[in-house]
């Protein structure tokens, strides 16, 4: 078997064996090593010497195999834009941010740049559960049969109606999507002016 070429090596067709870890240098028509994540090019390659890499200085990073001559500056998550940190910046990865609780991403440019408050879901509805928190605004869906939700809230969940018989009571008024079942003591009639979820 033919020995594997080690950078720097000549390339006539302008392509390199390992696209992730090597790049084509057109001036010398050679393939040179890229620098690994967390490093940058401190000396470019030549026909007789491969790329020399150096580690990124503190508070900077490069995420990919690269032939950059600088590292990118770490940026904090901007709380004014509604963002919070979920993982710190290291030499190999930028700071990872997400929307603060109760917010969703309203502006996206490769990553989220601005979060806004989730809209309220009115009584009788709840926010549809999403795969990823903070990805989009609330989509309110009606409570399913036998459930209610009685507030305007971005996060309140529909709750099952109270089962009066479980408490030794009887139903005085059925539950709706916006209110719980009203229960009463089986021995007492329910006066028409009385309301509330439980009458004793």
């Amino acid at each position: 078997s033919q020995p594997q070429a080690v950078p720097p090596y000549a390339s006539e067709n302008q392509t390199c064996r390992d696209q992730e870890k090597e790049y084509y240098e057109p001036q010398h028509r050679i393939c040179c090593s890229r620098c690994p994540p967390g490093t940058y090019v401190s000396a470019k390659c030549s026909r007789i010497r491969d790329t020399v890499c150096a580690t990124c200085a503190e508070n900077s990073y490069n995420e990919h195999w690269n032939y950059l001559t600088i590292c990118q500056l770490c940026r904090p998550c901007d709380p004014v834009m509604g963002l919070e940190e979920i993982a710190p910046c290291t030499s190999k990865r930028k700071t990872q941010c997400r929307c603060q609780p109760g917010m969703f991403c309203a502006a996206w440019a490769l990553e989220c740049t601005h979060c806004e408050l989730l809209s309220d879901c009115p009584p009788g509805t709840e926010a549809e559960l999403k795969d990823e928190v903070g990805k989009g605004n609330n989509h309110c869906v009606p409570c399913k049969a036998g459930h209610f939700q009685n507030t305007s809230s971005p996060s309140a969940r529909c709750q099952p109606h109270t089962r009066c018989e479980n408490q030794g009571l009887v139903e005085a008024a059925p539950g709706t999507a916006q209110s719980d079942t009203t229960c009463k003591n089986p021995l007492e009639p329910l006066p028409p002016e009385m309301s509330g979820t439980m009458l004793m």
Epitope: P37, T55, H64, T90, K92, R93
Partner: antibody, heavy 121, light 113 residues
Framework: EVQLVESGGGLVQPGGSLRLSCAAS????????MSWVRQAPGKGLEWVSG????????NYADSVKGRFTISRDNSKNTLYLQMNSLRAEDTAVYYC??????????????WGQGTMVTVSS | DIVMTQSPDSLAVSLGERATINCKSS????????????LTWYQQKPGQPPKLIIY???TRESGVPDRFSGSGSGTDFTLTISSLQAEDVAVYYC?????????FGQGTKVEIK
């Protein structure tokens, strides 16, 4: 040759203090984060504390927060761990470990041989 | 904290046979921006410090024999020793470095059957 050598371990009474040192050689010490990782007898590995290359960022496991302090002297190529209010459960071999990063959140590519800390009355 | 769970706790394999160790993280450790899993494997022989053998979940550290390989993504990872040698008897640990604090699995002891 890249090398880490720990020292300062020993027997100490509960409530006592100890200062561990880790002398580094063979690499640009100030460019890399360092951590302390411990291993109780017959048990697994537990990260204790980490410090960034400049010393500007530090972090601690909840189990040692407020009792242990990590520091470094880049002019002496030395990492330290000041351990106060020691408890029996701190008994372990303490390893210093180098990260391939200025941040301690990375793979630990070089480890020292470890120094034994025994907390007992 | 991200919890790392290894299985099995120990395994005995005949010389020349395959050994497989699993590691599961309680949270995703794949960073979508660079498609890298922030997971490493260490080998610890009796009386010695741990030694890095795999990083980025599947990249072998230089000098590590090619019988060691790492695979998996997201939350489920595997370390495979394709043909167990006597010198591979050790405890193997996975570790995530996706988020602070870095956390280790409880270890898997590999012995010869």
């Amino acid at each position: 040759e890249v090398q880490l050598v720990e020292s300062g371990g020993g027997l100490v009474q509960p409530g006592g203090s100890l200062r561990l040192s880790c002398a580094a050689s063979g690499f640009t010490f100030s460019s890399y984060a360092m951590s302390w990782v411990r291993q109780a007898p017959g048990k697994g590995l537990e990260w204790v504390s980490g410090i960034s290359g400049s010393g500007g960022r530090t972090n601690y496991a909840d189990s040692v927060k407020g009792r242990f302090t990590i520091s470094r002297d880049n002019s002496k190529n030395t990492l330290y761990l000041q351990m106060n209010s020691l408890r029996a459960e701190d008994t372990a071999v303490y390893y210093c470990a180098k990260s391939d990063n200025w941040h301690y959140l990375d793979a630990f590519d070089i480890w020292g041989q470890g120094t034994m800390v025994t907390v007992s009355s | 904290d991200i919890v790392m769970t290894q299985s099995p706790d120990s395994l005995a394999v005949s010389l020349g046979e395959r050994a497989t160790i699993n590691c599961k993280s309680s949270q995703n450790v794949l960073y979508s921006s660079n498609n890298k899993n922030y997971l490493t494997w260490y080998q610890q022989k009796p009386g010695q410090p741990p030694k890095l053998i795999i990083y980025w979940a599947s990249t072998r550290e230089s000098g590590v024999p090619d019988r060691f390989s790492g695979s998996g993504s997201g939350t489920d990872f595997t370390l495979t020793i394709s043909s167990l040698q006597a010198e591979d008897v050790a405890v193997y640990y996975c570790q995530q470095y996706f988020n602070t604090p870095p956390t280790f699995g409880q270890g898997t002891k590999v012995e010869i059957k």
